[in-house]
């Protein structure tokens, strides 16, 4: 069986204040069982950006339909970008646990930076 890979194709994403940014993440396997979450930063202080199961993330939407069967596209869109949104974003696969899920594998990250405003 194929080992799970987390693919974040863009190392750098230049965004414009006020616009919507799309952060891409695809996986190569449905297994192991468990969710994919998005974070900004690494380590214990990282910020949760999106968890489909719980939480309120009004500026985040998923690229793929949440009712899509056997989904392997975990890309997200973040609207109304501000300078506070810059940083490196990681999609992270968790292995289902009881009671706690366990981090299994992280994508390589996509750095979001501000690009020049269009003239």
């Amino acid at each position: 069986e194929e080992e799970l890979q987390m693919i974040q194709p863009e190392k750098l994403l230049l965004v414009t204040v006020g616009k919507t940014a799309t952060l891409h993440c695809t996986v190569t396997s449905l297994l192991p069982v468990g969710p994919v979450l998005w974070f900004r930063g690494v380590g214990p202080g990282r910020e949760l950006i999106y968890n489909q199961k719980e939480g309120h993330f009004p500026r985040v939407t998923t690229v793929s339909d949440l009712t899509k069967r056997n989904n392997m596209d975990f890309s997200i869109r973040i609207s109304s970008i501000t300078p506070a949104d810059v940083g490196t974003y990681y999609c992270v696969k968790f292995r289902k646990g009881s009671p706690e899920n366990v981090e299994f594998k992280s994508g390589p990250g996509t750095e979001m930076a501000l690009g020049a405003k269009p003239s």
Epitope: E1, S29, L31, P32, V33, P35, K53, T62, K96
Partner: antibody, heavy 120, light 108 residues
């Protein structure tokens, strides 16, 4: 066409052991989690166990007694049942998991089931 | 553990009539709910997932609705082949996956 075929059921005494098998075909077996669900005579459905790749999950009622495993080279799912009790008497179904909502699993294909009777 | 309560336990309906089956969850499961049909001596069959999405090949007379803790399976015009037991299942929080106790739809 997806097919799941259980075997290995039968009559066993309390405290005994049995191994169920489920032969899968018609889908890429190694890419999906698979599950055992049981149904006691005249009763409802009860989840028993699920296996992903190396990850396994059990109902409290069978934890420590049952072991789920899979052989992807044979497209086969197993359930080793030890220390069997009268309350384990049921039809055991294997089912293919399907995921939705980024992390939730339901069961889109089921086998016809194999009957396990635990009786002295 | 999330408990699913189905009501009524038995529903007596005449062919051609509408049947409305209820499934209540003990806590919020968002839309992570499936419905299955089981006929005597047969395995369960998936009807609905994500609370409202009909599985491929399932007739349009079957529809699912609801979210959170209250869900409904509606069979708009019962056919003879629809008399069976129906189960709901949540997959929002597991293990364990949990099923409702079932609703038997019988001929009136």
């Amino acid at each position: 066409e997806v097919q799941l075929l259980e075997s290995g059921g039968g009559v066993v005494q309390p405290g005994g052991s049995l191994r169920l098998s489920c032969a899968a075909s018609g889908f890429s077996f190694s890419n999906f989690a698979v599950t055992w669900v049981r149904q006691a005579p005249g009763k409802g459905l009860e989840w028993v166990s699920t296996i992903g790749s190396g990850d396994t999950y059990y109902a409290d009622s069978v934890k420590g007694r049952f072991t789920i495993s899979r052989d992807n080279s044979k497209n086969t799912l197993y359930l080793q049942m030890n220390s069997l009790r009268a309350e384990d008497t049921a039809v055991y179904y294997c089912a293919k998991d399907s995921t939705v909502s980024w992390s939730g699993d339901f069961f889109d294909y089921w086998g016809q089931g194999t009957l396990v009777t635990v009786s002295s | 553990e999330i408990v699913l309560t189905q009501s009524p336990a038995t529903l007596s309906v005449s062919p051609g009539e509408r049947a409305t089956l209820s499934c209540r969850a003990s806590q919020n499961v968002k839309n992570d709910l499936a419905w299955y049909q089981q006929k005597p001596g047969q395995a369960p069959r998936l009807l609905i997932y994500a609370a409202r999405i009909r599985e491929t090949g399932i007739p349009a007379r079957f529809s699912g609705s609801g979210s959170g803790t209250e869900f409904t399976l509606t069979i708009s015009s019962l056919q003879s082949e629809d008399f069976a037991v129906y189960y709901c299942q949540q997959y929002y929080d597991w293990p364990p996956f949990t099923f409702g106790g079932g609703t038997k739809v019988e001929i009136k």
